[in-house]
């Protein structure tokens, strides 16, 4: 069933107790949203405004450069993933406002949250791809001169999107609408029913491929880049460190609650107190993860402008300088202004 003949119910949220008292009225209402949900709504609103504008600007700037500069390809894909995620936020916002009621039908329940998940994972995996590119620029400059081209960059992006799609399939397949009898409400969520093992497997795969692996990639890549930077006594090593900390820390901080609660819920009984507590925090964890969708443009702009007062320039002009800079290796572009100088020193030295 794709849609329900849903009428605004007579009842709000209830905390059901185990006692049976048949002589009390049924019309006690409580329509207040929980504190975690209110916080989630605030975060969603901010992320939507900043994310849509910020990523739209990045897409606009990088789209013109994507044919000839590799960095523009990375940032274009990353911004598209974040931008698409942000577009789905009004749907999530509306659902939370209505106490998690889902008035958008079964098809929308399968597609929209899965699309959000697709884009979120695409963002993570693209960050890992960019990190690998940074690593190769520093440690394999000769290889980069020979093979690092726009075609390969697009293939890498396609692989990232493809893997993100694979990670999203279980969510799409198991997503269902459930119309609860009381309070009258349609919910959109995943239902593994008889297969708890499959639910756990999906959660573990999601944690490993969507969080731990990219985290490991980022950490290793930037650790080696940092070590090389320090060993060459690069003049801008502290600036590089700031970029590394910003990228890795934002990844860590904003995705950690979502992944931890997700894996915990897959191992808990749905009726357990811990599960119910985590479920109440679910929207907040999702909104917290969504900060990634608007933080990336901010990180790149702040790090890229190198605190040199370039904010006096127009924002598109600033972004163009940051996202489409030439690097020493062929036509490849640097990740940020801070790494450009250190890359130059390293490629000359290696």
């Amino acid at each position: 069933m794709d849609s329900f003949n849903y009428t605004t119910p007579d009842y709000g949220h209830y905390d059901d107790k185990d006692t049976l008292d048949l002589n009390t009225p049924v019309d006690k209402t409580s329509n207040t949203l929980r504190v975690p949900d209110i916080l989630a709504l605030v975060i969603f609103a901010v992320v939507f405004l900043v994310g849509v504008l910020g990523n739209a600007l990045v897409v606009w700037v990088t789209a013109f450069e994507a044919k000839r500069t590799i960095n523009a390809i990375w940032f274009l894909n990353l911004a598209v993933a974040d931008f698409l995620s942000c577009l789905a936020l009004p749907i999530l916002f509306t659902s939370i406002v209505q106490h998690h009621h889902w008035p958008f039908g079964g098809a929308a329940c399968s597609i929209l949250p899965s699309l959000i998940l697709l884009n979120m994972y695409a963002s993570i995996l693209l960050l890992a791809t960019i990190s690998a590119d940074r690593f190769l620029l520093v440690f394999k400059p000769i290889w980069c001169q020979n093979f690092r081209g726009a075609g390969l960059a697009w293939i890498a992006c396609a692989v990232a999107w493809g893997l993100a799609l694979l990670l999203t399939i279980p969510s799409f397949l198991y997503r269902v609408v459930r119309e609860e009898y009381f309070p009258p409400k349609v919910l959109c969520g995943v239902d593994y029913s008889h297969d708890k093992r499959r639910e756990r497997a999906v959660a573990i795969v999601r944690l490993v491929l969507g969080f731990l692996w990219p985290l490991l990639t980022l950490t290793i890549c930037y650790t080696f880049i940092l070590l090389r930077t320090w060993s060459r006594r690069a003049t801008r090593s502290t600036k590089t460190l700031k970029v590394v900390v910003a990228v890795v820390a934002s990844f860590f901080i904003f995705w950690l609650p979502y992944q931890v609660t997700g894996i915990m819920m897959s191992f808990l009984e749905p009726s357990s107190p811990t599960f119910l507590l985590l479920k109440k925090l679910d929207s907040l964890c999702v909104s917290f993860a969504y900060i990634n969708c608007c933080i990336n443009p901010i990180i790149y702009v702040v790090a890229g402008q190198g605190f040199q007062g370039r904010l006096r320039k127009s924002l598109p002009s600033l972004l163009r300088n940051v996202l489409t800079e030439e690097s020493v290796v062929r036509e490849s572009k640097s990740f940020t202004r801070s790494t450009v100088d250190t890359m130059a020193q390293k490629t000359q030295a290696v």
Partner: antibody, heavy 123, light 112 residues
């Protein structure tokens, strides 16, 4: 004591409509939802829908959508269930049942039932 | 819709026997509030159903202690510890978590 008294047996022709009543007593009528459940001969129980006597809000099972109408008369504490376009497979005993609740009044339980009304659809 | 499957569909037992009836839901019937609205009814021929157990394991007022319910998620059981002559009837499980509310097909308990 709580009582749900239903109207008498009905014999109807295919395509006709039937209206079954259920008079409540012994409790505050508007405080409890009223559901209708039917049972075909030798078969199990089948939920048809409910009515909230306080607001008039109704919810019908998809299977009966468009054919069933539930109404109430608060002055007489009576709920009505009308089923139209009758067919032979609608031959069943129709029960009205009150949904009780917990200490927040949530209507999660069918704690009291009417005696049942036999509806026979035959040409 | 949630399908409720009871087994066995009928069983013969003697007075004093311990009897177990199982009920399986086609999907999880855990409510978003954490409760499971799985109930059990007893029905005798020509009579309206009688409410026995609510929310998996809670006995309704006046229901003898020999009746007990258990289970979670999708699998549930009704146990009668020591059958009495008045217990021979048809038993139905029902879920009130999701719309439409659905019942099992019934388990007829007969005297051996």
């Amino acid at each position: 004591q709580v009582q749900l008294v239903q109207s008498g047996a009905e014999v109807k022709k295919p395509g006709a409509s039937v209206k079954v009543s259920c008079k409540a007593s012994g409790y505050t009528f508007t405080n409890y939802w009223m559901h209708w459940v039917r049972q075909a001969p030798g078969q199990g129980l089948e939920w048809m829908g409910y009515l909230n006597p306080s607001s008039g809000y109704t919810k019908y099972a998809q299977k009966f959508q468009g054919r069933v109408t539930m109404t109430r008369d608060t002055s007489t504490s009576t709920v009505y269930m009308e089923l139209s376009s009758l067919r032979s497979e609608d031959t069943a005993v129709y029960y009205c049942t009150r949904s009780g609740g917990d200490n927040y009044g949530n209507p999660y339980y069918f704690d009291r039932w009417g005696q049942g009304t036999t509806v026979t659809v035959s040409s | 819709d949630v399908q409720m499957t009871q087994s066995p569909s009928s069983l013969s037992a003697s007075v004093g026997d311990r009897v177990t009836i199982t009920c399986r839901a086609s999907q999880s019937i855990v409510h978003s509030n954490g409760n499971t609205y799985l109930h059990w009814y007893q029905q005798k021929p020509g009579k309206a159903p009688k409410f026995l157990i609510y929310k998996v394991s809670n006995r309704f007022s006046g229901v003898p202690s020999r009746f007990s319910g258990s289970g979670s998620g999708t699998d549930f059981t009704l146990t009668i510890s020591s059958l009495q002559p008045e217990d021979f009837a048809t038993y139905y499980c029902a879920q009130y978590t999701l719309v439409p509310l659905t019942f099992g097909q019934g388990t007829k308990l007969e005297i051996k």
